[in-house]
């Protein structure tokens, strides 16, 4: 990809021009003494000659002017090559330099990014919840203002009539006062009559207002007599229960044998006659220690133990090493079974994986471990897996070797940074890795272009947040 | 109960290097991620280094990558931190640590001055 091109220029020097690449090279190099141009005359020191040169002396001069052309081109095919070498070394430098402090200043700003949108992340979820609860606080005051408005509203109507009654009453006795002056005694009479008849009146509504008052006390008093009978009554029943339920197992040994079963997953449940979807209790193994798990009874044969579920967003999956330890949330909705649980299960038998994807376009897709087992809290409950198949990915999201489980407050993974303070949710984090499906759940058309979502990369790229999960296990010999 | 002492450490002209070692003890060394971390005075505890369990797969600070090396020897239950290059800001306390029942185990530390 080079060029090399000579020229003369005007005052005579020999001009050289390198094209290397984008970029051209050219050197002026001044005429040896022993090397002018042939197109010049050669003027000798030594005193004019009458008669022209012998030819011999010319043949002679030239064979060393080719001479010195000779290793003129060979000089110059020397420089060529040696700035040509040149080149091509500071080239390759300034490329790698280029490239390697372009990836150094893309990581720098693409961590700066993360933290920086992390904190943003937080930040907004505080101003959100700040906002929401100012909203709120609001709409109350607008709604108690609002009913007090009314009452006011309701309150100035009855007045304006009451008003507008008494304006025509007043100007009709006027007009009545005005008119017959002189009946004006028996007028004030009959509103003295009037007067009276009001005041009987109202002495009559006082002492049925008075009756009122004594019978709602009386009725108030009878309500609690009421409610403390039927509360005697209810205690009744439940102490008859409870002593029907006693009598009854004490006489039926079959009852308290069926009670005394437990099952370790819910492949044993599955096979001890309860083919239906729902929550079970199993117990750890060699414990009488007990959890609550969803079996799932219909899924490819049935008998799988879900350890994961996400569906909704309901529960918040961003908690403590204690709380994946134990486990978190509703088994009927969204939850982590527990790391502890999981372990001891996983270490009694061989036990496969499963887990099952949903996408926002109503797409599902699968991953399938052929060998699944956690370690013990010692090595941080690293997850170990084997045999890969399914439809989403050929390559395993969850990367191997297995990682050791990380969260908020158990930083376990193999990056300088802290994957789940960044990424949220515990996981099996890498540096940070190709999933996590503990992550922030985000609704539909706000699921792209999350870097902490719910994420399984060999599926839906690295941006993408899933729209439901659920990991289950199984006995491999099911 | 897990023990990890840490050796190497010393003064060191700038451009100098120095070998860090970490021996482990009292627990499966072959099954541990293995990290290195350095202290100033009045500084947070950073990590500069760490080697996985398996594979050796390694991670590096920046301030510290294409100086610093990483190693492990599972036979002598000992990790490396080859330093090279050294400078100024690199002087330091280097703590060996290992993360077992999700907590840090430290060793004692080594000091490494690098000064001219």
């Known amino acids: 990809y080079n060029n090399f091109r000579k020229s003369m220029d005007s005052i005579g020097k020999k001009q050289y021009q390198v094209q290397h690449g984008s970029c051209s090279y050219t050197f002026l190099l001044p005429e040896m003494d022993n090397c002018r141009s042939s197109s010049s005359p050669y003027v000798s020191n030594a005193v004019q000659r009458d008669a022209p040169l012998e030819y011999d002396d010319s043949v002679q001069r030239l064979q060393v002017l080719e001479n010195i052309m000779e290793n003129n081109t060979q000089w110059l095919m020397k420089l060529e090559n040696y700035i040509q070498d040149n080149m091509k070394k500071e080239m390759v430098e300034i490329q790698q330099n280029a490239v390697q402090n372009q990836t150094a200043v893309m990581i720098e700003i693409g961590t700066n990014l993360l933290n920086q949108t992390a904190e943003q992340t937080r930040k907004l979820t505080d101003v959100e919840a700040q906002v929401l609860n100012q909203t709120t606080r609001l709409e109350l005051q607008l709604l108690e203002h609002s009913l007090s408005t009314n009452k006011l509203e309701k309150q100035i109507l009855d007045q304006t009539s009451e008003i507008n009654k008494l304006q025509d009453k007043n100007s009709f006795l006027e007009k009545k006062v005005l008119a017959m002056e002189d009946k004006h005694i028996i007028q004030l009479q009959s509103i003295k009559e009037e007067k009276d008849q009001l005041q009987v009146l109202v002495s009559k509504q006082n002492s049925i207002i008075e009756e009122l008052e004594k019978k709602i006390v009386t009725a108030t008093v009878n309500n609690s007599v009421l409610q403390k009978q039927q509360h005697d009554l209810m205690e009744t029943v439940n102490n008859l229960l409870t002593m029907m339920s006693t009598s009854n197992s004490a006489k039926d040994p079959t009852v308290a044998k069926e009670e005394q079963i437990s099952f370790r997953d819910c492949a044993e449940v599955f096979k001890s006659g309860h083919t239906t979807n729902g929550i079970y209790t199993l117990t750890f193994p060699n414990s009488t220690e007990e959890i609550k798990a969803y079996c799932d009874m219909e899924a490819g044969g049935g008998g799988w133990t879900i350890i994961q579920r996400r569906e909704d967003g309901s529960v918040d999956f961003q908690r403590t090493w204690k709380e994946y330890k134990v486990g978190f949330g509703n088994p009927s909705g969204e939850y982590w079974l527990g790391n502890e649980f999981v372990s001891q299960l996983t270490n009694q038998q061989r036990y496969v994986l499963k887990i099952h994807l949903k996408d926002w376009e109503g797409n599902e897709a699968y991953s399938l471990y052929e060998h699944f087992y956690l370690s013990s809290e010692e090595l941080n409950y690293r997850i170990h897996l084997k045999g890969l198949t399914g439809t989403a990915g050929k390559i395993s999201s969850i990367s191997q070797p297995g990682n050791d489980f990380s969260t908020k407050d158990g930083d376990n993974d193999k990056c300088i940074c802290k994957c789940s303070q960044m990424l949220t949710g515990g996981w099996w984090f890498d540096a940070c890795g190709p999933s996590n499906l503990n992550g922030m759940y985000y609704p539909q058309r706000q699921n792209t272009n999350k870097f902490n979502g719910i994420k399984w990369y060999y599926w839906k790229g690295s941006g993408y947040s899933l729209k439901a999960t659920t990991m289950m296990i199984r006995p491999a010999d099911f | 109960q897990v023990q990890l002492v840490e050796s190497g450490g010393g003064l060191v002209q700038p451009g100098g290097s120095l070998r860090l070692s970490c021996a482990a003890s009292g627990f499966s060394f072959s099954s541990a991620t293995m990290s290195w971390h350095r202290q100033t005075p009045g500084k947070e505890r950073t990590m500069v280094a760490l080697?996985?369990?398996?594979?050796?797969?390694?991670t590096y600070a920046d301030s510290v990558k294409g100086r610093f090396t990483i190693s492990r020897d599972n036979a002598k239950n000992t990790v490396y931190l080859q330093m090279s290059n050294l400078k100024p800001e690199d002087t330091a306390v280097y703590y060996c640590?290992?993360?077992?029942?999700?907590?840090?185990?430290w060793g004692q530390g080594t000091q490494v001055t690098v000064s001219s």
């Open positions: 640590n290992t993360r077992r029942y999700n907590r840090d185990f």
């Open positions: 080697i996985a369990y398996a594979g050796g797969s390694t």
